[in-house]
């Protein structure tokens, strides 16, 4: 069964997924998809990395953490009720049937009606076991020049907040991480 994560309409949802690279810079391709993890790949792919970089993504989906260190947790920006459902994170470790995969269930709640919004960002806090994927991209993959309209200062701020948060440390210290090599 899927591990469940929650977020409110209008917030950013956080779906955790980590692995430990065998060596610094020795990355494993990862994909995220909407829908449960099928036998190969990630259903409808929304984001993927290769051995070097994020080489494909779609609007509102991005990696907030340091994916070069194995933090491939997915952030979904400004969620709506339509974002509810199962997501697949897959780390494709080379070899014979080595893929690691995990299904995460995202539940979106209607926004609370509150007088004044606070600065607090509610990242969904819980952590599953682990997921994984592998794939090599086509020649015509998207480049960094085609980033969706996201404020880069906001990205940096969000990344720093998550990186510095106790939640991030707790997640990394939970031991629910795939080690490669």
């Amino acid at each position: 069964s899927e591990v469940e994560y929650r977020a409110e309409v209008g917030q950013n949802a956080y779906l955790p997924c980590f692995y430990t690279p065998a060596a610094p810079g020795n990355l494993v391709p990862v994909c995220w998809g909407k829908g449960a993890c099928p036998v190969f790949e990630c259903g409808n792919v929304v984001l993927r990395t290769d051995e070097r970089d994020v080489n494909y993504w779609t609007s509102r989906y991005w990696l907030n953490g340091d994916f070069r260190k194995g933090d491939v947790s997915l952030t979904i920006e400004n969620v709506t009720l339509a974002d509810s459902g199962i997501y697949c994170c897959r780390i494709q470790i080379p070899g014979i049937m080595n893929d690691e995969k995990f299904n995460l269930k995202l539940v979106i709640k209607p926004a609370k009606v509150t007088p004044a919004p606070t600065r607090q960002r509610d990242f969904t806090a819980a952590f599953p076991r682990m997921l994984t994927t592998r794939g090599h991209g086509p020649a015509e993959t998207q480049t960094l020049g085609s980033l969706p309209d996201i404020n880069l200062t906001q990205i940096s701020t969000l990344a720093n907040e998550l990186r510095d948060s106790r939640l991030a440390n707790d997640l990394r210290d939970s031991g629910a991480t795939i080690r490669i090599g």
């Epitope: 036998v39 259903g43 470790i93 080379p94 070899g95 014979i96 080595n98 090599h136 020649a139």
Partner: antibody, heavy 122, light 107 residues
Framework: EVKLVESGGGLVQPGGSLRLSCAAS????????MAWVRQAPGKGLEWVAN????????YYLDSLKSRFTISRDNAKNSLYLQMNSLKAEDTAVYYC???????????????WGQGTLVTVSS | DIQMTQSPSSLSASVGDRVTITCRAS??????LAWYQQKPGKSPQLLVY???TLAEGVPSRFSGSGSGTDFTLTISSLQPEDFATYYC?????????FGQGTKLEIK
């Protein structure tokens, strides 16, 4: 037009080896997982193996993984199946099939070759 | 392994009939199900993928439905060229598995 053409089938004695090839054309070969599926005479379809885009990840029917090896050469738009220690029960038509693409989404074998017959008999 | 069970194994029908073939998975496969048609001496042809999406070039009289463990392929009005064997196949778990087939014959 998408085309998959298998070759390399034939009659082989039990314990022998055979290498099947599949020549692909009409699509960007390196953007797709590829598969081998077989069909024994008068029987149903049985999945044999799959390979990812660059050949770094492979998947097999458990009972075959010690004897069969799937590989690909993207520069030649070709898929291969090396079959060793062949048994009578490996007798079948072997099909090459195109599987899911780089962006996921379409889960099914959208295109099949015409098949190549492998007969294992003494 | 996920077992795929088709029913019926064979069925006789007439041109113009509405025909339904069912496929049951032994475990939840979500919507990762495909249907194929195979005629004697020919390669299988994809009809439906992701349980309900019609493959390119497939006539609209074919339709697929279901999710989870129970799936159906429906032919709304049988044509002479539809008499063949039909297979379901799951793309959720390894190994990939097919149903045993349903042979559709002319009554």
């Amino acid at each position: 037009e998408v085309k998959l053409v298998e070759s390399g089938g034939g009659l082989v004695q039990p314990g022998g080896s055979l290498r099947l090839s599949c020549a692909a054309s009409g699509f960007t070969f390196s953007d797709y997982y590829m598969a081998w599926v077989r069909q024994a005479p008068g029987k149903g379809l049985e999945w044999v193996a799959n390979i990812n885009y660059d050949g770094s990840s492979t998947y097999y029917l458990d009972s075959l993984k010690s004897r069969f090896t799937i590989s690909r050469d993207n520069a030649k738009n070709s898929l291969y199946l090396q079959m060793n220690s062949l048994k009578a029960e490996d007798t079948a038509v072997y099909y090459c099939a195109r599987d899911v693409g780089y962006y996921g989404g379409n889960y099914g074998f959208a295109y099949w070759g015409q098949g190549t017959l492998v007969t294992v008999s003494s | 392994d996920i077992q795929m069970t088709q029913s019926p194994s064979s069925l006789s029908a007439s041109v113009g009939d509405r025909v339904t073939i069912t496929c049951r998975a032994s475990d939840n496969i979500y919507s990762y199900l495909a249907w194929y048609q195979q005629k004697p001496g020919k390669s299988p042809q994809l009809l439906v993928y992701n349980a309900k999406t019609l493959a390119e070039g497939v006539p609209s009289r074919f339709s697929g439905s279901g999710s989870g463990t129970d799936f159906t392929l429906t032919i709304s009005s049988l044509q002479p060229e539809d008499f063949a064997t039909y297979y379901c196949q799951q793309h959720y778990g390894s190994p990939l598995t097919f149903g045993q087939g349903t042979k559709l014959e002319i009554k």
